[in-house]
């Protein structure tokens, strides 16, 4: 189950050369940050820039095969954005109490950077991703999953934390972005749109997916996510596009179904363990790679970045159920909890496959407009 | 280094009060505003189970058990989490540890809470 193949073939975004504004359109809300005003003079960077230490390779794991009847990004049309109607999503409010602002939220005021200096950061996350600028870079190999497949039990906590639904997982779950690039998992959660609304968080040539999944990892080098926030690499997220697609997917079904106990803010259940890996995209060896911050406050920097480039497709039942079940703070709905698209201020994601190149019969001389920085250069 | 502290327990007749404190230090203190805060209990012999959980903006969950008898708050210019306890049963002696759940579970050591005539 493909979408037909436009631009002949080429990989999605074909047509974009623009630099930093996704397809030059200033004026899309939803695609860039709120006004600038705040930006500090210098970068919001937290302390620590220096490089993490451990250079063992995990254990090796053969990479997933990819599903048939998967869906990839590079089969699907380019989309122009149209221009969401929401407000972007980079705002938190003055907590009751009055003086403490670190209660934020999506939308409202006051901006984020009151609620931590780094989310006026020069690097932030999440980015609009143009394939035709993704700088190839073929030393990135395919991602490395050990221990994901969990039995029942122990059972994980399924929390409606306010900001999201978020599952926590349990030690055990290695993932390696390269050799020396060791990460365990340490939870999941979700951002989500509204009905006829898309919701994820990065952008592919302004086009905004239904849903995105993220897995947040911690760098072994640290122990605690305290320690890694701020440092390069300290924490590392895969994230995956979900999709529209005819059949229920029965991975995310196992979560799902589980959302009406926990409409409430704050509130908990316990599931039980699951394939993690089966949430993500099969193919672990087409992604996208950036350096970025969390999406949500302190917004701290340092936070690697890796962007399926195949999607994951939920049935269109799924997709209602997650962004119609749960509630947020102040009796308001969870819905359209994703922050604004931020400039990459001269950063360049890396591809781990020729995403750039046009592929089609037109183009005799296949040209790639960004370079890859080799790791260590 | 300790991260979470909690304090306030003891001894207690049924009917009467308790306050718990949790006092997040170090690099805790960091992320505590951005965590979702819990007080858990565990009895000799049980698992342990959550009491009361509050999010970063403030909403607050509780077991079915102590709802109507327990609040919890939080002051995050403090770094604190508060369990207020009222109208204490026998069947709430436990040790009560507090939690912060920021991407991953930052623990205390305990308080033990007896509630005993």
């Known amino acids: 189950q493909r979408l037909p193949r436009m631009q002949e073939d080429s990989p999605l975004g074909g047509g974009s050369s623009g630099e930093d504004d996704p397809l030059g359109e200033e004026d899309l809300p939803s695609e860039e940050d709120s006004p600038r005003e705040e930006d500090p003079p210098g970068e919001e960077d937290l302390p620590g820039e220096e490089d993490l230490p451990g250079e063992e390779d995990l254990p090796e794991v053969k990479p997933k095969s990819e599903e048939e009847g998967s869906l990839k990004l590079e089969d699907l049309p380019t989309v122009e954005a149209p221009g969401d109607p929401q407000e972007p999503q980079n705002n938190a409010h003055r907590d009751k109490e009055g003086d403490d602002q670190s209660h934020w939220r999506y939308g409202g005021d006051p901006p984020w950077p009151r609620v931590s200096p780094a989310c006026a950061g020069r690097f932030q996350s999440p980015v609009d991703i143009r394939p035709q600028l993704a700088a190839f870079c073929p030393a990135l190999r395919p991602l490395e999953l050990l221990g994901f497949q969990l039995p029942p039990l122990p059972e994980l906590r399924l929390r409606n934390n306010g900001h999201s639904v978020q599952l926590t997982l349990p030690p055990g779950l290695e993932m390696a972005l390269g050799p020396g690039r060791e990460y365990r998992a340490l939870q999941l959660h979700l951002h989500w749109g509204a009905a006829g609304r898309p919701g994820s968080e990065h952008t592919v040539e302004g086009h905004r997916f239904p849903a995105e999944i993220h897995v947040v990892h911690l760098s072994t080098a640290f122990a605690r996510v305290d320690e890694a926030l701020g440092r390069p690499g300290g924490l590392a997220v895969l994230a995956a596009f979900l999709e529209e697609g005819p059949e229920e997917n029965s991975a995310y079904e196992q979560l799902l179904s589980r959302l009406e106990e926990i409409a409430e803010e704050g509130s908990e259940t316990q599931v039980p363990g699951l394939d993690i890996s089966a949430l993500l995209p099969s193919d672990f060896s087409r992604y996208f790679q950036y350096e970025g911050s969390l999406t949500t406050p302190p917004c701290a920097q340092g936070v690697i970045w890796t962007v399926f480039n195949q999607t994951v497709m939920l049935s269109a039942k799924q997709l209602h159920t997650l962004s119609d079940t749960l509630w947020g703070p102040g009796d308001s709905r969870l819905q359209l909890n994703f922050r604004a698209t931020q400039p990459l201020n001269g950063r360049v994601i890396e591809a781990s496959f020729p995403a750039g190149v046009d592929s089609s019969p037109r183009a005799a001389e296949p040209v790639q407009l960004n370079s890859c920085l080799a790791a260590g250069d | 280094q300790v991260q979470l502290q909690e304090s306030g327990g003891g001894l207690v007749q049924p009917g009467g009060s308790l306050r718990l404190s949790c006092a997040a230090s170090?690099?805790?203190?960091?992320?505590?505003?951005?965590?979702?805060m819990a007080w858990y209990r565990q009895a000799p012999g049980k698992q342990r189970e959550l009491v009361a959980v509050?999010?970063?903006?403030?909403?607050?969950q509780y077991s079915s058990s102590v709802k109507g008898r327990f609040t919890i708050s939080r002051d995050n210019a403090k770094k604190t989490v508060l369990l207020q306890m009222n109208s204490l049963k026998p069947e709430d002696t436990a040790v009560y540890y507090c939690?912060?759940?920021?991407?991953?579970?930052?623990w205390g050591q305990g308080t033990q809470v007896t509630v005993s005539s």
């Open positions: 939690n912060a759940d920021y991407y991953q579970d930052y």
């Open positions: 170090g690099g805790a203190r960091n992320i505590f505003s951005f965590a979702a």
């Open positions: 509050i999010t970063s903006a403030g909403g607050t």
